[in-house]
């Protein structure tokens, strides 16, 4: 029950996280301009990964997409790549985790297969979350660097023909959305990995049934011959819980791939 809950919660948390990563990637407010007034009127500029927008104090907004002519910084391209990789990995992870959910029955899928799928999706969510956090952090670093550069270099000129105004850019809403979303995806991934441990078949907690073959006294139980002869190594010195009764099965084998009901 706890495993199902952990897996389900991990899935939901990751789903919210990935939705957030997608939202952050599409948002225009990655960098917003520090309050700056043009001598004429207040026109604010805010920029995303894909386009730049200007907004008047009246609320009128115009956005234009970046074009190759601008020679965008390599860092921006890297941020775009990280966010897209994060989304793709997250989407695949979601798809895998749907089939891995314990509450969903698909044919005669074994628990071991579900455990593997849960682990796979968990790892994908963790990497997806890390990609998003890395992407947002790289952009934030660009902003901080730009902020101090523009503070130090207030006015530059080409014979008075160009004037770099105090247009310092600060963290936009998308950065916070990205950080939170990346964190949620990461947490969801960890939860899926934890759930995987609970899903993975462990040592059996039932009494093995002894079948006496004519000639040799050999006890067979699910898990193969090596576990049934009574000569196996007993490094763990564990006993199967049997409510106090003793059986001839005192030697506990290591769990094998098929050691479950």
């Amino acid at each position: 029950m706890a495993v199902t809950a952990c897996q389900g919660l991990g899935f939901v948390v990751s789903l919210i996280g990935i939705a957030g990563i997608i939202a952050a990637t599409c948002m225009d407010q990655w960098s917003t301009q520090d309050l700056y007034n043009n001598p004429v009127t207040a026109v604010f500029n805010y920029q995303g990964l894909w386009r730049s927008c200007v907004r008047e104090s009246s609320g009128f907004t115009e956005c234009r997409g970046y074009f190759t002519l601008l020679g965008l910084p390599a860092m921006l391209q890297a941020v775009r790549a990280l966010m897209i990789v994060g989304i793709v990995l997250g989407a695949i992870g979601l798809l895998v985790s749907i089939f891995a959910l314990k509450c969903i029955r698909i044919g005669s899928m074994e628990d071991s297969a579900k455990a593997n799928m849960t682990l796979t999706s968990g790892i994908m969510f963790i990497v997806s979350g890390l990609c998003a956090i890395a992407g947002v952090s790289v952009f934030a670093n660009m902003l901080v660097t730009n902020f101090w550069m523009s503070t130090a270099n207030m006015y530059t000129g080409m014979g008075g023909m160009v004037q770099t105004v105090q247009t310092r850019y600060t963290f936009g809403a998308a950065l916070f959305v990205g950080w939170v979303a990346g964190g949620l995806t990461l947490i969801g991934g960890v939860m899926m990995c934890i759930a995987c441990r609970g899903l993975a078949p462990e040592e059996t907690n039932y009494k093995a049934v002894s079948y006496h073959a004519s000639g040799h006294s050999v006890a067979y139980k699910p898990g193969g011959f090596k576990a049934s002869t009574g000569f196996g190594s007993n490094t763990k010195n564990k006993k199967i819980y049997d409510g106090g009764a003793r059986t001839e099965d005192e030697v506990q084998s290591y769990p094998s791939k098929h050691d479950y009901v």
Epitope: T41, V43, N45, V54, F60, G71, Q163
Partner: nanobody, 120 residues
Framework: QVKLEESGGGLAQAGGSLRLSCAAS????????MAWYRQTPGRQRELVAA???????DYADAVKGRFTISRDSAKNTVYLQMNDLKSEDTAVYYC??????????????WGQGTQVTVSS
């Protein structure tokens, strides 16, 4: 990066008209504001008229009702229609553009200026 090309200046009679135009070219992402300033010898540069990307306009009190600023966003061009010219309108008119040129880059550019002379 961004070049502002002014045209339309010259000599005009008092009460006459002139139309100035300023075309912005180069690496332009968004033009936030385009404006016209003027400067007479010994005086500071003063704002004449300005227009935002959304079409909001602002005029100096001395030119209100006589001058009209307009823009063509597609051509990144701003126009200043000057009617009922007075001798005090004689000055060098400068085009100004507040431009977003790239990621985290917003600069103010100035044109070379065009002379407007009003004879009485």
């Amino acid at each position: 990066q961004v070049k502002l090309e002014e045209s339309g200046g010259g000599l005009a009679q008092a009460g006459g008209s002139l139309r100035l135009s300023c075309a912005a070219s180069g690496r332009i992402l968004n033009i936030a504001v385009m404006a016209w300033y003027r400067q007479t010898p010994g005086r500071q540069r003063e704002l004449v008229a300005a227009i935002t990307f959304g079409g909001s306009t602002d005029y100096a009190d001395a030119v209100k009702g006589r001058f009209t600023i307009s823009r063509d966003s597609a051509k990144n061009t701003v126009y200043l229609q000057m009617n009922d010219l007075k001798s005090e309108d004689t000055a060098v008119y400068y085009c100004n553009a507040d431009v977003v040129t790239g990621l985290m880059r917003r600069d103010v550019y100035w044109g070379q200026g065009t002379q407007v002379t009003v004879s009485s």
